[in-house]
């Protein structure tokens, strides 16, 4: 029986060009975490395997860094990074747990927004 729960950072926002840490935490179970997959929409970003360590998908190598812990750091954020992210915990003997995070990437600063709408 699956008794565990995934806690996530929930809905988060970050500035364009900056970085953000995606974090999930599995609690209320004694199951062993064998692997954690991180996905964005329909794409696999990275994997942390208990025996093998980290694997970052080649297309994200420049902008994704492993950790801290089982989390994932996204760097050089763009507006296109806005969307849903999923942590997928493969555990033994429980099975698979999933968590969802929604990231909104905002324009760099309020000042920048203000400048854009100034009347000449």
């Amino acid at each position: 029986m699956m008794t565990g729960t995934i806690e996530t950072t929930g809905n988060i926002s970050a500035e364009k060009g900056g970085s953000i840490i995606l974090q999930c935490h599995l609690s209320s179970t004694t199951a062993q975490v064998t692997q954690v997959n991180w996905e964005q929409q329909d794409q696999l970003l990275a994997i942390c395997n208990a025996d093998l360590g980290w694997h970052i998908s080649p297309s994200f190598k420049d902008r994704v860094a492993p950790g801290p812990g089982l989390g994932l750091t996204l760097q050089s954020l763009t507006v296109n990074d806005t969307g849903e992210y999923f942590c997928i915990y493969h555990t033994y003997p429980d099975g698979t747990y999933t968590g969802r995070i929604f990231l909104e990437v905002l324009e760099s600063s309020v000042a920048e927004h203000g400048a854009r709408f100034q009347i000449p």
Partner: antibody
């Protein structure tokens, strides 16, 4: 060159037991998860069992749980499948397969060993 | 348990044509899906892992894609050596399940 060679297949009566072996070579056996997959006479593929690289974790479908036991001897580079309380529906070609690192796909398969359960 | 529904069960096509085989999962299994090819009298061979990643040595005419719970294997410009059976397989909740298979035959 990666090689997986299965053996131990036979004709056995319903209720009987059989132990299959898979000899691995050409790779570091102790660092890979391994699986048994069978192909039924109607050509369907059925997953039978999986074991983690160190042997700590074993996985089975409900259809064989409690009847089949997967094990490994990393010192001998050998994978095993102990089958008991065999049924006619266990009749199949049994393949051992290696799992891709990080991904749960099976990247190398043996040639298979045939198991027939019939009275 | 998650069910994998593979379609079509069989397909009769000509060399040079493009075909798409699909597997639908009864729940979201994210990228935990692989595709295999099996030729008559041979063992299965992996084509695609993690839904979209081409295995080593697999020709680029093969491609895997995913949209939600639907997974597709596309073969562009079929060659004579591509005829055989194709299977999808998932890993989820500590279980591996194969689709029912698709038999690709020469028209």
């Amino acid at each position: 060159e990666v090689q997986l060679v299965e053996s131990g297949g036979d004709l056995v009566k319903p209720g009987g037991s059989l132990k299959l072996s898979c000899a691995a070579s050409g790779f570091t056996f102790s660092t890979y998860g391994m699986s048994w997959v069978r192909q039924t006479p109607d050509k369907r593929l059925e997953w039978v069992a999986t074991i983690s690289s160190g042997g700590s974790y074993t996985y089975y479908p409900d259809s064989v749980k409690g009847r089949f036991t997967i094990s490994r001897d990393n010192a001998k580079n050998t994978l095993y499948l102990q089958m008991s309380s065999l049924k006619s529906e266990d009749t199949a070609m049994y393949y051992c397969a290696r799992q891709v690192h990080y991904f749960y796909a099976m990247d190398y398969w043996g040639q298979g060993t045939s198991v027939t359960v019939s009275s | 348990d998650i069910q994998m529904t593979q379609s079509p069960a069989s397909l009769s096509v000509s060399v040079g044509e493009t075909v798409t085989i699909t597997c639908r999962a009864s729940e979201n299994i994210y990228s935990n899906l692989a595709w295999y090819q099996q030729k008559q009298g041979k063992s299965p061979q992996v084509l695609v892992y993690a839904a979209t990643n081409l295995a080593d040595g697999v020709p680029s005419r093969f491609s895997g894609s995913r949209s939600g719970t639907q997974y597709s294997l596309k073969i562009n410009s079929l060659q004579s050596e591509d005829f055989g059976s194709y299977y999808c397989q998932h890993f989820w909740d500590n279980a591996y399940t194969f689709g029912g298979g698709t038999k690709l035959e020469i028209k």
